[in-house]
């Protein structure tokens, strides 16, 4: 871009006519304060482009900056612009007139700012004063911009002398604003809604006084705009919120809602997004399944948990053997359903100090008007094994018969063992397992019965010893996943006159 005359600053005589030409290899135009002043564009014989800006019969009001810019958007390499500044000293005009909004200067932190009182004559001396105090402040003055410095929250006025009269500017008001690093949070009252229900999304900014909110949302694509409401939420720290509300959601309102926040007084900004799903009907669906058989241990507490997803909030019922369960006053049974996220639920059945009678078939059912789901399982109460009796008998044929009876849940296993050295048995010498032996020294028979009312197994094991030629310590041991139990008996040969 080439400007002729080259500038960068001109001081023009009042009432004169002044012509500025900007030339380039691409089309150009003149701008003044984002306005396009009167100008003529031309394409020259040599292929260059020019725009001629004519300032006719100039006055002090023509004082200001002018830019020559490319007048097409051919990319960033053409975003260059050239600036010139024109003064038209005008004794009838003191300070250049200002738009009323430019008299209010918002300052962030301790950043340098400008009080933009400008005069038409670069030779004039200009001073800055606090309005209440008439002492000039020592702040540097730029005739093209104004006073540049760090200012307190006060009221200021500029002064100059034209000829023999003192001229005051308008009053400038400086306000300090709280502008911290911008931190935006977006939340929705619900991110899942049924069609016809409302969508409400809040965008909140903390610790900033002056911010702009800009929303993008699915409805914008079809040109249906929603007017957000912005609120100042008092408190410490201060919060400003913008609320987007759609009273009657449609399926097409599903999608991403983005809140873009920019600070008016600087270039800081942030944006956050949230997804909203509009569904035709409500739903309930299980997120986890349970094994068909659940185990509880006798006299221990057991919590059974079902995780599911639903919208809207469903009702939840638990059943045992087809009978509805409720919290028991004795505190033996606790039912609870809690909302762990917007659409996620955990329903728990807690059995306190489980009893055998609590074994059975359980069902959880979650339902609402649109959908329902249920989950069933069998609760097995495990009971530690007990050896209830270990007895012996001596039939006439010379055999010794040992009978061991015990109970437990799950089904206990029976192990018989023997030890011949009574003094060292069983601590110092491992017992020898007994069972059906090929030598027919012993014969073992075990019967198992499940007692429905007690929900446990009974095991009766009979051990037949063909002949016992010396004293034996015989042990019957029952074992299941809950533990083990055993009893011992000493068996002596028939020929011995005593029994230990």
């Amino acid at each position: 871009l080439v400007i002729t005359p080259p500038g960068p600053e001109f001081v023009l005589n009042i009432s004169s006519t002044f012509v500025l030409t900007c030339s380039s290899s691409a089309p150009v135009m003149w701008e003044q304060m984002s306005q396009v002043p009167w100008q003529e564009a031309a394409m020259n014989q040599d292929g260059t482009f020019s725009s001629v800006l004519t300032l006719t019969n100039v006055t002090g009001g023509d004082t200001g900056e002018y830019f020559c810019v490319y007048n097409n958007s051919l990319g960033p390499e053409l975003s260059e612009r050239k600036r010139i500044y024109i003064f038209v000293p005008d004794p009838t005009m003191g300070f250049l007139p200002m738009d009323s909004e430019d008299l209010f200067i918002f300052v962030t932190d301790v950043t340098e700012t400008t009080i933009p009182c400008r005069v038409t004559d670069p030779q004039l001396e200009v001073t800055l004063h606090e309005k209440k105090v008439d002492i000039p402040l020592h702040v540097p003055y730029d005739h093209q911009r104004g006073f540049i410095g760090t200012f307190e929250d006060k009221t200021y006025i500029c002064k100059t002398t034209i000829g023999d009269r003192e001229v005051d500017s308008d009053t400038y008001y400086v306000y300090s604003l709280q502008v911290s690093s911008i931190n935006v949070s977006v939340n929705a009252v619900q991110t899942v809604v049924r069609q016809g229900e409302s969508i409400t999304i809040r965008c909140i900014v903390m610790g900033n006084d002056v911010v702009n909110f800009q929303w993008t949302y699915p409805r914008m694509k079809s040109g249906r705009l929603v007017e957000p409401v912005t609120d100042y939420l008092f408190g410490v720290p201060s919060r400003i919120g913008s609320i987007l509300h759609i009273p009657t959601a449609e399926l097409s309102d599903s999608g991403t809602y983005t809140c873009n926040v920019s600070v008016s007084v600087n270039d800081h900004g942030d944006e956050k997004a949230i997804n909203v799903t509009v569904i035709e009907n409500g739903y309930v669906r299980l997120l986890e399944t349970l094994e068909d058989v659940q185990i509880a241990e006798l006299h221990r507490s057991r919590t059974l948990q079902v995780v599911f997803e639903a919208y809207p909030t469903p009702s939840v019922l638990w059943f045992k053997d087809n009978r509805t369960l409720g919290d028991s006053s004795a505190g033996e049974l606790v039912l609870s359903t809690r909302n762990v996220s917007e659409t996620r639920y955990v329903s728990e059945l807690t059995l306190v100090r489980v009893k055998v009678s609590e074994a059975g078939y359980y069902t959880m059912r979650a339902f609402h008007a649109d959908d329902q789901v249920q989950l069933s399982f069998k609760l097995q109460v495990n009971v530690p094994v007990r050896v209830l009796e270990l007895s012996e008998s001596h039939p006439a044929n010379g055999e010794q018969i040992l009978r061991c009876r015990g109970r437990g849940m799950p089904q206990p296993n029976v192990t018989w063992s023997t030890c011949r050295d009574l003094k060292r048995c069983p601590r110092k010498l491992s017992p020898t397992p007994l069972g059906n032996s090929s030598k027919e020294e012993s014969q073992l028979e075990t019967n198992v019965t499940f007692w429905e009312e007690d929900q446990e197994y009974e095991v009766v094991s009979t051990l037949r010893l063909r002949h016992v030629d010396q004293p034996l310590s015989v042990r019957c041991m029952l074992q299941n996943s809950m533990g083990r139990d055993s009893q011992e008996v000493t068996v002596v040969p028939h020929s011995l006159p005593f029994k230990v």
């Epitope: 004169s16 006519t17 012509v19 014989q45």
Partner: nanobody, 125 residues
């Protein structure tokens, strides 16, 4: 280098008319303002008229008796500027100069970088 060649001057009776022409020797791509100035012996150079784009300007001394115009671009890119002077008076006697500028004050001779050698206009009674 661009040269400006003036023509059309001469002796004319008071109340008569003249049409002055100014022709650049080569194309004047960088030139924005074409103007006429005059200088009588012992006087300063005085602005007469100027033309740029679709705009024209006239000095106070001959206002109402002048028309400045420009012909269409010829094949070689040269533009001839014309000054039509009517109802000439004795005090219009002077050397008339053609000048070209790329921008600046329209009325000020200091804004013009290129000057012709001038053409003499003499108004007799």
């Amino acid at each position: 280098e661009v040269q400006l060649v003036e023509s059309g001057g001469g002796l004319v009776q008071a109340g008569g008319s003249l049409r002055l022409s100014c022709t650049p020797s080569i194309t004047t791509a960088g030139t924005t303002i074409m103007a006429w100035f005059r200088q009588a012996p012992g006087n300063e150079r005085e602005f007469v008229a100027a033309i740029w784009g679709s705009k024209t300007a006239y000095g106070d001394s001959m206002k109402g008796r002048l028309t400045i115009s420009r012909d269409n671009v010829r094949d070689n890119g040269q533009k001839t500027v014309f000054l039509q002077m009517n109802n000439l008076q004795l005090q219009d006697t002077a050397t008339y100069y053609c000048a070209a500028s790329s921008g600046g004050y329209v009325h000020s001779s200091t804004s013009y970088e290129i000057w012709g050698r001038g053409t003499q206009v003499t108004v007799s009674s």
